[in-house]
């Protein structure tokens, strides 16, 4: 019998290398049950994950799974950093794992560099 | 059934190249991190690197960092690892496993591929 | 990077033998979930890794109730209550806490 707990999928130590001045949605893959929970997203400073208040967020419905999302309209050097969402359930709070986003300013990189780049080059990404 | 299937043993020569494939089935490979493993003849386990199926993105050790690329097509469920420039010292073999990337949950292993590099 | 060290490096046993097998790291494995990603590996000879234990204590599907992890912070260990014939192999600990990952040298498990 599968479970009925609310699930938060963002796998551990995932990460996205985005450039800033370009969109991007940050995506919370929720799997639940009967009630969708409420879902917020905090970014971390240190230990401790501050919540994001009036930011654009949304939801997206996929046929097992639902999508709690935060946009980045458009993305910007101060978005670098790791986020987490949580889900209210029960009366219990459910913690995703974090996720890094690294942010390159493309007004100081010549030219893009790819993913993997930006993730062994941490001087081109802002902390 | 979850299986790993790697592909057969390869026998190359100093200075090619090689690209070894582990084909995934039984789970969804976008849940998952391919770790790729490299273990000499007579010696213990070494960590090359792993690559997230789902988006593409990969960490390598720096003992490996610019010597192989790992990639994965998640459309067929198949990870690779390339090694490039071999020498006799890539006489190994090499392993894939994926451990689902949420939870831990599980922690399969491919049988291996045996490398020999020889003149 | 991370240090796996194990102990012993080989040791031999008797078949419903007790055995202990440590593992300690060279920094903490706690991750900032407040989880300590450190697995334990089975190998056969001739055959691939198995994985028996993650997050130091969890047994895999199927893996007897006979093995048994525990620890944190920097210190591991691996405990088989009582040897089986089936359980002489290579044992592992490999880290994935911190990049790069990585794994102890290896415990070779023989019959005394």
């Known amino acids: 019998k599968e479970s009925c707990d609310v699930q938060l999928y963002i796998k551990r130590q995932s990460y996205h290398s985005i450039f800033a001045g370009d969109p991007f949605k940050l995506e919370c893959p929720v799997k639940y049950c009967a009630h969708r929970p409420q879902v917020t997203w905090c970014k971390l400073n240190g230990t401790t994950c501050v919540k994001l208040e009036g930011r654009h967020t949304s939801w997206k419905q996929e046929k097992n799974l639902s999508f709690f999302i935060l946009h980045f309209e458009p993305v910007l050097p101060s978005d670098n950093g790791s986020y987490r969402c949580s889900a209210n359930f029960l009366s219990a709070i459910i913690e995703s794992h974090s996720t890094t986003l690294y942010v390159t300013d493309v007004k100081s990189a010549s030219e893009r560099p790819s993913k993997d780049e930006m993730a062994s080059r941490p001087w081109l990404l802002y902390s | 059934e979850v299986q790993l299937v790697q592909s057969g043993a390869e026998v190359k020569k100093p200075g090619e190249s090689l690209k070894i494939s582990c084909k995934t089935s039984?789970?969804?490979?976008?849940?998952?991190?391919i770790h790729w493993v490299r273990q000499m003849p007579g010696k213990g386990l070494e960590w090359i690197g792993r690559?997230?199926?789902?988006?593409?993105?990969?960490k390598y050790s720096p003992s490996f960092q610019g010597q192989v690329t790992i990639s994965a097509d998640k459309s067929i469920s198949t990870a690779y690892l390339q090694l490039s420039s071999l020498k006799a010292s890539d006489t190994a073999m090499y392993y894939c496993?994926?451990?689902?990337?949420?939870?831990?949950?599980?922690?399969?292993w491919g049988q291996g591929t045996l490398v020999t590099v020889s003149s | 990077d991370i240090q796996m060290t194990q102990s012993p490096s080989s040791l031999s046993a008797s078949v419903g033998d007790r055995v202990t097998i440590t593992c300690r790291s060279s920094?903490?494995?706690?991750?900032?979930?407040?989880?300590?990603?450190l697995n334990w590996l089975q190998q056969k000879p001739g055959k691939a890794p198995k994985r028996l234990i993650y997050?130091?204590?969890k047994l895999d599907s199927g893996v007897p109730s006979r093995f048994s992890g525990s620890g944190s912070g920097t210190d591991f260990t691996l405990t088989i209550s009582s040897l089986q014939p089936e359980d002489f192999a290579t044992y592992y600990c490999?880290?994935?806490?911190?990049?790069?990952?990585?794994f102890g040298q290896g415990t070779k498990l023989e019959i005394k």
């Open positions: 496993a994926s451990y689902e990337g949420y939870y831990e949950r599980f922690g399969y």
């Open positions: 920094q903490s494995l706690l991750d900032r979930d407040g989880k300590s990603y």
């Open positions: 997050l130091v204590s």
């Open positions: 039984g789970f969804n490979i976008k849940d998952t991190y």
């Open positions: 490999w880290q994935d806490t911190h990049f790069p990952y990585t």
């Open positions: 690559n997230d199926p789902a988006n593409g993105n990969t």
